[in-house]
């Protein structure tokens, strides 16, 4: 469940170094304690690693992918799984470990040489790719310092968010991706159910601006669930 | 390793608001969780907000939700801390910090590995 995943006893790390006038908060040397967490939380091992519950790709680390783990995926939360390396089947690119990305089902490098011309096939032929990453560091990073000079400008072809400039991000229209406005207070917006109903969207909206939540309007409260209008609000 | 450098700090009066910038170098800071820490004279350092590689992720401390909103540009590898209604009790050095973010977990639990040195916020009453 939900709870069992978050509510976890992984053994946890000591925090970084905090280094006072003579020490050096730069450094990643040996621990030391002293940072307050909320809860008592300090670190996770990777030796421990527990699964976190996610709703979006975007939500996992970069070396994750948000799937449910069973493999009907039809089985309540999606977690956060691990990414596959080269050679394994997939559905798209988020799926497949930094330095690769889905094509024809199968991560594969991410070849510069090749890349700018298979990656604009792979845009138009997956319509599954949700949220689509490809550059050789980590599939999180940008993609456009690679490959693009500038940012992709509104409506211009995208793969993920950072290919886009600011204030836009790379949201699905028909098959391929474009880069759309992030949605401003009161615009409407698509507050996902953790069963990645997002991967059916032809029309994908961007997320809310910064400081914005995606949240029940308070006049559709008493709405069925089914026409609930969510709107970019305040914190 | 990836370098740290923290501004925008400065004195502001009770109910004011300053925004917090932290830019880096030297790594891949799109692929890295950011922290921001505060120390406040006499008092252990302590875990204010962290937002994950994407955006996508947002933690708060209980004491400074609805007034602290925390932001990245990937693009200009910066990450954002806007303080509105500044309270005395806010005054700390503020320090940005950043780890890997290749498996996710809750926000305060992550290893922060780099460090800035901190930017000091003076709020008077």
């Known amino acids: 469940t939900l709870n069992s995943v978050l509510n976890s006893n992984a053994i946890k790390n000591l925090p970084p170094p905090l280094g006072g006038a003579a020490g050096h908060p730069g450094s990643a040397v040996s621990a030391a304690p002293g940072i307050l967490y909320p809860g008592g939380n300090k670190y996770q091992t990777i030796d421990n690693y527990q699964p976190y519950p996610c709703a979006e790709d975007e939500e996992c680390g970069t070396d994750e992918y948000c799937a449910s783990p069973t493999r009907g995926g039809d089985a309540g939360v999606q977690i956060c799984l691990a990414c596959r390396k080269r050679r394994k089947r997939c559905m798209r690119h988020a799926m497949c470990c930094p330095g690769n990305y889905c094509k024809n089902g199968i991560c594969v490098s991410s070849d510069q040489n090749h890349f700018r011309g298979e990656i604009e096939e792979t845009i138009t032929e997956s319509f599954g790719n949700d949220h689509s990453t490809l550059d050789g560091y980590s599939r999180r990073t940008t993609l456009s310092s690679k490959m693009y000079h500038t940012k992709g400008q509104e409506g211009s072809v995208c793969l993920r968010s950072s290919d886009c400039a600011s204030g836009l991000c790379c949201a699905r229209h028909f098959w391929s991706k474009i880069c759309k406005p992030v949605l401003k207070e009161g615009q409407v917006c698509t507050k996902h159910r953790r069963k990645g109903s997002h991967g059916l969207e032809i029309f994908q909206r961007c997320y809310c601006g910064e400081g914005l939540s995606c949240r029940i309007q308070k006049d559709h409260h008493q709405a069925s669930n089914s026409s609930r209008l969510h709107t970019c609000q305040r914190h | 390793e990836v370098q740290l450098v923290e501004s925008g700090g400065g004195l502001v009066q009770a109910g004011g608001s300053l925004r917090l910038s932290c830019t880096a170098s030297g790594g891949a800071f799109s692929s890295t969780v950011v922290g921001w820490f505060r120390q406040a004279p006499g008092k252990e350092r302590e875990f204010v907000t962290g937002?994950?590689?994407?955006?996508?992720?947002?933690y708060y401390a209980d004491s400074v939700k609805g007034r602290f909103t925390i932001s990245r540009d990937n693009a200009k590898d910066t990450a954002y801390l806007e303080m509105n209604s500044l309270k005395p009790e806010d005054t700390a050095v503020y320090y940005c910090a950043s780890g890997r973010d290749r498996y996710a977990r809750a926000l305060p639990d992550y290893e922060y590995l780099w460090w800035g040195q901190g930017t000091q916020v003076t709020v008077s009453s």
């Open positions: 937002i994950n590689w994407s955006g996508a992720r947002t």
